[in-house]
Each structure stands twice: as C-alpha cells, then as structure tokens.
C-alpha cells in the first residue's frame, strides 16, 4: 500500500463557513459531548463547562464555572506545581449521568474531584466526590471515560505522581479496578473506552463488554529500549470481582496486542493515538478505526487500521494466553501458555452456559480460573485489521483524533469516510476508493496552527457536523463544503460522497440535505468528469495594459493534484521563458508587453483520475496591449491618474443559449480602473464560474476613459 | 488589597481626544480580562469595550466601533482607553473594571470623568 | 443585542422588609446573569453572580434566583445603606448588556 497522496482540495481557514466558540480566558477545550435530541453540544474546558447550541456552537446556552480555591492552588504549588497551569481543575469526565444530569470530573489541583451537573439550573450540586481512579491529578496525563448504565468507567492513574495506573468501574454496589501489576497494566496511556452491547437476538445470554485501548510499554518484547504496543483491553459489565482471588477487582480484564503494519515494508505503527467505534445500521458487528503512529516518529508517519469487533472478541473467546517465564538472572520472559485452561474460561463474561454449569455471578468463579487470568491478562494472539493492512498511510502529518461516517453514494456504494484531525489544526477526510485512499479534502479548522485535542461527529440526519475542540477553542465544521464547487467537473472531481452536481440549479449540493429525491443529480466516484453536461454558459475576462508594462492573469484551480498550464492562440506556453513566469504555481505573469501579446490566453488544468486524464479550461483571459493616450475626461468626474501599467480589465459572460451578455455602460474594476461598455461576446467559451461585477454610476459610453492604475499586475 | 485607579479624564471639545488610563495593583494584573464601562449623567451602565488578559480578543460596541480604542500593558499593569472623534453622547464617568469568566466584574475602579462639549 | 428590563424603576420600601428586584432578558440567558449595586456617587460593587452564586463580602441577606428570560434579586431584610440602584448584566452574548437600573428608596 503507497503513502496516501496529498489533499485534493485544501481550504483554509477564512475560504469557508466555520462556526466557532471560545470563551475569552478560557483554554483547554479537551471534553464535549453532543445531546442529539437536544440539538446541545456541552464543551468541558479548563474551569469550565459550557453548553452551547449545537447547530450554531457560536451560541453559548449555559456556563458554569468550577475553580480551584487559592487555598487549594497554594498547596499545589508547594508540591511543585505550577499555579498559573497545572493547579487549575481541567475539565476531563463529562459524561451523561441521566437525562436530566451530568457527571463532570476534574483534575482540582492535583486534587481529582467529581460532581453532578444539573442541566436544567446549570449548577453543580456540589457533591465534591473524590475523583481519584476517575479522573487523572495531572492535567497532562492520559485518561479515558464511559458512563455505561449509569456507571462511570475510567482508564487513567490513581496517583499524585501518575505512577499507579488503573482502570475502574466507579459503582455504589459493585466497585472494581485492575491489579496494580506489570503484567496488567504498564506505564499505559489512555487512548479511548467505549461499552459493546450485547446483542438482542444472542443466544448464549451473554454480557455487555467495556473496551479499554491505550498504548504501553510491551512486557513481551525485550529491546535496548522501551517498545510501546497498542493495547486493546476488555471487561465484562456483569463483572463482580473475585470472593476472594481478586476481591474487588476485575476477573474479566483482558487484552490484546493490535497490529498496524505495512507489511511488505516493515512500517509498525505501535502508538495509539485515538479509536472510534463505527455503529451503523448495516453493520452487524461495529468496526473500529484506530489511529496509530510509529513510536519513533521524526518524519511525521500517521496510519488508520479498521478492525472487526468480532476479531477482537474471537481472540478473548478464543485465543491462546502469554505467560511470564523466569530465565536466568531473574529476567522475566513472556511466551505463549500451552497448558491446560481452567474452566469456565478465565477473563471470559459469565453467560448461558456458566450459568448452567451454576457460575451466576463472577463471585462464584473457581479460584483456579481467578487465579489464572490473574497471572494471564495478555493474550498471546493478536487483534488484526481488516485486510491485514492499513486503510491509511499518510506520511508528513501527525494526526491526532479521528471520527469516520459511513455514507452512501448515488449509486448504492457504501464508504466509509474518515475525518482525520492534525496537530497542526487542520482537519483530513479521506475515504478509499478501489484499494487506493483518496484524501478529498483539508480544512484549517484552527487559525493557529494548534492541536486538535478532540473530535466529535453528530449522527442526527439532516444538519451534520464534525466539531473540533482544541486548546483556544472549539470549532464546528459541515461534513462537506458541496457549495464551493462551482462547476460540474469540480463537483465530480471531489469524488466527495456526499457531494452531487444538480444540473437544474447548476450547483453542487450535499446529497444528504436535499430532501428531493436524487434523480438527475451527477456524482461520479471514479471521477469521470465527462458525464458533466456541456458548459452552457463560459465568461472570459477582457483586459487592457499599457505597452512596455507587466500583467497577471489569475487562474483559480483549488485542487491540488492539478497541473497547471497556459495557452496562447491554441498554443501551450513555456512558463520557464524570460517572457513568461508562473506566480503561485497558477497565475501567469507576461513580462514587457507589446502588442503581439495580445490574445486569447487560456489557463487549462490536467488531472489524473485513475487512468484517465482530465483537462479543464478554468479561466479565459482576452488580452489588449495598448499604447495609452491622453486620458479623456468626462467633464463631471475627476480622475487622478497614477503610474502603473494595468490600465482596465473587464468580465464578459457569453451565453450559447441566445440570451445577450450583461452589458453594464461602464464596469469598475479591481484596479479601480473604468471601461468602456463590452463588445458583444464571441459564444462557447469556457467558464470561470463566480465573478463578482461591481458597476458604478452609468456614464456615457462616447465619454471614452483610461485610467492607469497603480495596481502593477 | 485590590486597586483599580483611572485617570485622563476631563473636558474636550467634539471631535477631539483622550486616552484614559487604568492602574491596577493588588492582584495579578495579567490573569483577568478588563472592561470599560461608562455612565452618562443620570443614567444607566454601559459596557464599551473589553479585552482579554492576554490582549487576544477585543469587544467593543458598536457605537463607539472605530473611535475608542481599548489596549493593555501587562508589564505596567495598566489598561488604556483611546477615545477619538468624540461626540457630546461620550460624556461620561468612565470606570474600569476587571472581568473573568466565573467571577463576573469583580472588581471596580472609582472612575473618571469625561465631558465632550464645545 | 440582548435586551434586559429592569422593574419597576423606583422601589420603595421600610427599613426591615423583604424586598425583590427583576430583571427579565429579551432571550433565554441561562444563568448568566449579576447583579450589581451602585450607591449615589459610588462605584458599582458586584453583589450576586451568575443568577445565584454568592459574592465573598457581601451581607447574606442579598439573594439572587431565576434561569432562562426571569431573574430575581432579593434583600430578606432592607437596611438604610441599601439605598442604591441596582443594575442586572447579562453575559451570554457580547455586548455584555446592563438592565436600566431599579432605584431603591427607603420610605
């Protein structure tokens, strides 16, 4: 599999409509969660819990603020702290409680604590319950939350020093945490935790499963070095712990090593970076994307593996177990347990059959089989991704949250988009096409440049939004940006499934928001531009420059994967030539002009789709090089004249469906210059779709007017 | 103890200027975000202008948009307001006060009087 | 921008009794809502914020209730140097607007 290509399409910050929100000094804006039914997006920051509306996150609802006492901020700080970051309470659980409630945890100064967050006072109930096991003391340490039946499970470190990681169910009746042990867990780092319901037609009874996944330092693998593995863990929801072997712990804790590879390069992706689970009505199983990168990571290597659920479980169901051996110089070795396993299976959910065999609750497991997932939290097997490979291979990125949607296509094709966010601000929506990743566009979600701390996607039809939270603030982007392709050939070229071209009102639309039904829409996803009806309507632009003079003739191609090119009276001109130069890679510079440069100048784009070639005329110019005479001045406008050498530039629509051109008497232009009224337009020219024409005050056309221009393009 | 003590006030002419200033001592200048809040003579509060501790978002309402300036020296502790172009509607007592999210405008100073007339 | 109301204008009451102050927004504002008092000549002094949280300093006999457009301040017990007017802000949206003012009057 080769390094995915660069975006097709890269849309910066200000080109498109992003909503954003941020409260003035207010940072961190690390945990949201989306109401759906209440259209409400609550944003956990540092020192702060906002709600805001979620289809338009500009709209703050609610506020409500928990800060650290200065007491409390003095004793931090004498541990060593900081007082103006670290001894701040960072918002890190938000978690739906009831319909009525949320659950919120925070750092606290180095001091975690929880509380319930009523939602229709917006004030906290002030509980102040003990967040240790929930909630992380350090805002830079890892953790990870799920509230599942009204109990919170957590991944994150139990410490001061965040030295004792765990991984707990916070529970009135039945409370539960790992083993402090290297075998269980190893310095991990918390990536995600998601519930797994048990499905309503299964016929073994069985449990409702949490997943764990973070990365930690391998106890398989002996280097010179630490080697990190990606972990995927997973208890059991009916988990009562042990009577007496594992009292209060878990007897269902167990994981697996996930491999990301690129085989036939030996490219291991071993850090985890962050997973989301894919549930989706035609999917039987949920399949879950996993974002990775490579452990030594100096050139900026990120990847994307997908795996079914069912693979995962069938190794925990399955699956051979590791076991540590002592080799000489008490080294501890891990190697695959050949020997006999207990029954009922260890770290297995209790279902049908252990209840038949009288094994109702964990509480009743044989010491054995405690005793045995005690000792054997690793198994030996792996997790695989689907087709052994990764979905995704970007090189020069790192990537830091990622969100997929699964969509269909006009013509019934499923795909799974992914939304992939950078550390640098900027966000990646990829989707693979025929075994290849096309990476259809980038948006500069962040000005700034500033991590994507977390990513949420909406799955209410209709109004679709991915929201990104970073350290300034969160900002809230659509699925596509359809509109922005202006032609037929761009809208197709996206190869965007939720983008399609509609002929009747010639726009690119989202297939998702049109209510009507889909016939006559184009969408292309091999991007066979040449099922776009013919141009109906092309514009060129007319331009006048004094003799001697420079000119630049804009060619706007947004897509990346586009070569640029320029014609002159049919001929392709040599941008390398003293006479000409290319600025932005697109727009061309004529240098020391002369009448014999005027013409047709044509700026065409080449794309390669697959194995076809796509040319495009994107913009038409009709040059005029003039000597320039004495203004004539009409007797009621003053003119200053400045130097420079653009003297007019005018747009001109052709139509070849008989309808004559807009011919406003006078057009004012970029360089601020007047020009006379068009001549009629020559018909079938290409388009350069969206030109803004600003007329001023009519004149008369005999009135005859040059201005130069200071604008030396 | 927490002090807030403006200063440049005084009687201008329409269409002329002046920069209040705003000193702060007692707490830690450079954590809160600062506002300027006006009163006309027997009137109402009205907020004019704010900016954040860092100087990364400013607010200013519309009516003074273009004319009034709001700007911060975390170094010396202070807070300006550049007024120009001002109008007999500016006449005012011009307070400043600190805002943080969570704390509202906690803190006060005794303001400044500023008359535009001709 | 949002508007708020602030009645009645005048408020007059005898030392000793229960007194309520409203304030009621031209939109939902959640709770984001203080309350601010100003004695004749004074500066304004922060009393309640964000519709019920208590200010450090300031007589437990100031009260504030309500979410959403209706917002109430109260004093359980008016005192002679409660004379003042009283301001509410809203700060859901920029610009952070203030209330007309209630004034308050000992009879």
């Known amino acids: 599999m080769a390094f995915a290509p660069i975006p097709r399409i890269t849309w910066e910050h200000r080109e498109v409509h992003l909503v954003q929100f941020h409260e003035p000094d207010i940072y961190n804006y690390s945990a949201l969660l989306l109401s759906e039914d209440k259209d409400t997006l609550y944003i956990g920051a540092r020192e702060a819990v906002f709600a805001v509306n979620a289809l338009n996150i500009s709209e703050k609802q609610h506020e409500v603020y928990w800060k650290v006492s200065e007491d409390k901020k003095a004793k931090c700080a004498e541990k060593g702290k900081s007082k103006q970051t670290e001894c701040l309470n960072y918002i890190r659980v938000l978690q739906p409680l009831s319909a009525t409630s949320l659950y919120v945890c925070g750092t606290n100064a180095f001091q975690p604590a929880c509380d319930h967050l009523n939602l229709t006072s917006f004030k906290f109930l002030g509980k102040n319950e003990d967040g240790k096991g929930r909630c992380p003391f350090d805002p830079a340490h890892s953790y990870t939350s799920v509230m599942v039946d009204g109990e919170l499970y957590s991944g994150t470190s139990y410490n001061f020093l965040g030295s004792e990681p765990i991984i707990s169910r916070n529970s009135s009746h039945s409370p539960l945490r790992t083993e402090y042990a290297i075998p269980w867990l190893n310095e991990p780092s918390f990536v995600f935790a998601d519930v797994i319901r048990k499905s309503p037609d299964s016929p073994d009874g069985e449990d409702d499963r949490v997943y764990f996944f973070f990365t930690e330092v391998s106890v398989e693998y002996e280097f010179v070095f630490r080697v990190l593995i990606p972990r995927i863990a997973r208890v059991c929801k009916g988990d009562q712990g042990g009577l007496r072997t594992l009292q209060k712990k878990w007897t269902s804790f167990l994981k697996a090593r996930l491999i990301c590879s690129r085989p036939d390069s030996g490219l291991v992706f071993n850090v985890l970076r962050d997973v989301f689970v894919l549930r989706s009505p035609g999917l039987k199983v949920p399949v879950f994307y996993a974002l990775f990168t490579p452990q030594l990571n100096n050139v900026g290597l990120s990847a994307v593996c997908a795996y079914n659920l069912s693979t995962a479980e069938e190794v925990f169901s399955h699956g051979k177990y590791m076991q540590s051996t002592t080799v000489e110089q008490s080294h501890t070795k891990w190697v695959r347990y050949n020997g006999p396993v207990p029954k009922p299976r260890p770290g297995a959910c209790i279902d049908s059959e252990a209840r038949a065999a009288n094994y109702t609750s964990s509480l009743n497991l044989p010491d054995k089989t405690l005793q045995f997932v005690k000792d054997h939290p690793l198994m030996d097997d792996s997790v695989t991704p689907i087709d052994n490979r990764p979905r995704l291979i970007k090189k020069d990125v790192n990537y830091t949250q990622i969100v997929v949607d699964r969509t269909q296509a006009l013509d019934g094709t499923v795909y799974d988009v992914m939304f992939v966010s950078t550390d640098r601000g900027a966000l990646h929506k990829a989707i693979s096409l025929e075994h290849a990743v096309h990476i259809i566009e980038e948006t500069q979600l962040f000005q700034d440049f500033e991590p994507v701390q977390t990513l949420l996607l909406s799955s209410k039809k209709g109004n679709r939004f991915v929201y990104a939270g970073s350290n300034s603030g969160v900002v809230q982007a659509p699925l596509a940006f359809c509109g922005k392709h202006g032609t037929c050939e761009d809208c197709v070229l996206a190869r965007d499934p939720y983008c399609a071209w509609s002929p009747p009102t010639a726009t690119c639309v989202a297939l998702h928001q049109t209510e009507s039904p889909s016939r006559g829409l184009i969408q292309e996803m091999s991007g066979d531009a040449s099922v776009c009806p013919d141009k109906s309507k092309g514009s060129y632009r007319q331009h006048f420059f004094k003799h001697g003079g420079t000119a630049e003739l804009k060619c706007s191609q947004k897509s990346n994967l586009a070569r640029v090119f320029w014609k002159f009276q049919n001929g392709v001109l040599k941008a390398e030539s003293p006479k000409y130069g290319l600025m932005g890679r697109k727009n061309l510079l004529i240098f020391n002009l002369s009448e014999g440069d005027s013409g047709v100048y044509q700026c065409l784009s080449e794309e390669r789709v697959k194995n076809k070639t796509v040319f495009q005329v994107v913009a038409k110019h009709v040059l005029e090089v003039k000597v320039v005479p004495k203004p004539v001045v009409a007797p009621t406008l003053s003119v200053v004249q400045t130097e420079g050498s653009r003297i007019a530039t005018k747009v001109l629509v052709a139509s070849t469906q008989g309808s004559s051109p807009p011919t406003p008497a006078v057009q004012a232009t970029s360089s601020g210059a007047i020009t006379l009224p068009p001549k009629p337009a020559p018909t079938g020219t290409s388009c350069e779709p969206k030109i803004v024409i600003n007329t001023v005050p009519q004149l008369h056309s005999e009135k005859t007017m040059y201005l130069k221009s200071s604008d030396n393009r | 103890e927490v002090q807030l003590v403006e200063s440049g006030g005084g009687l201008v002419k329409p269409g002329g200027s002046l920069k209040l200033s705003c000193a702060a001592s007692g707490f830690t200048f450079s954590d809160y975000g600062m506002y300027w809040v006006r009163q006309a003579p027997e009137k109402g509060l009205e907020g004019v202008a704010y900016?954040?501790?860092?100087?990364?978002?400013?607010y200013s309402v519309d009516k003074v948009k273009g004319r009034f300036t709001i700007s911060r020296d975390n170094a010396k502790n202070t807070l300006f307001l550049q007024m120009t172009s001002l109008r007999s509607e500016d006449t005012a007592m011009y307070y400043c006060?600190?805002?943080?999210?969570?704390?509202?405008?906690?803190?006060w100073g005794q303001g400044t009087s500023v008359t535009v007339s001709s | 921008d949002i508007l708020l109301t602030q009645s009645p204008a005048i408020l007059s009451v005898s030392p000793g009794q229960r007194v309520s102050f409203s304030c009621r927004a031209s939109q939902s504002i959640g709770t984001s809502i203080h309350w601010y008092q100003q004695r004749t000549n004074g500066s304004p002094r922060l009393l309640i914020k964000y519709a019920s949280e208590s200010i450090s300093g300031i007589p437990s006999r100031f009260s504030g209730s309500g979410s959403g457009t209706d917002f109430t301040l109260s004093i359980n017990s008016v005192e002679s140097e409660d004379i003042a007017d009283y301001y509410c802000?809203?700060?859901?949206?920029?610009?952070?607007?203030f209330g007309g003012g209630t004034k308050l009057e000992i009879k």
């Open positions: 900016i954040s501790s860092g100087s990364s978002t400013i």
């Open positions: 006060a600190t805002w943080l999210p969570g704390n509202a405008m906690d803190y």
């Open positions: 802000q809203q700060s859901i949206r920029w610009p952070y607007t």
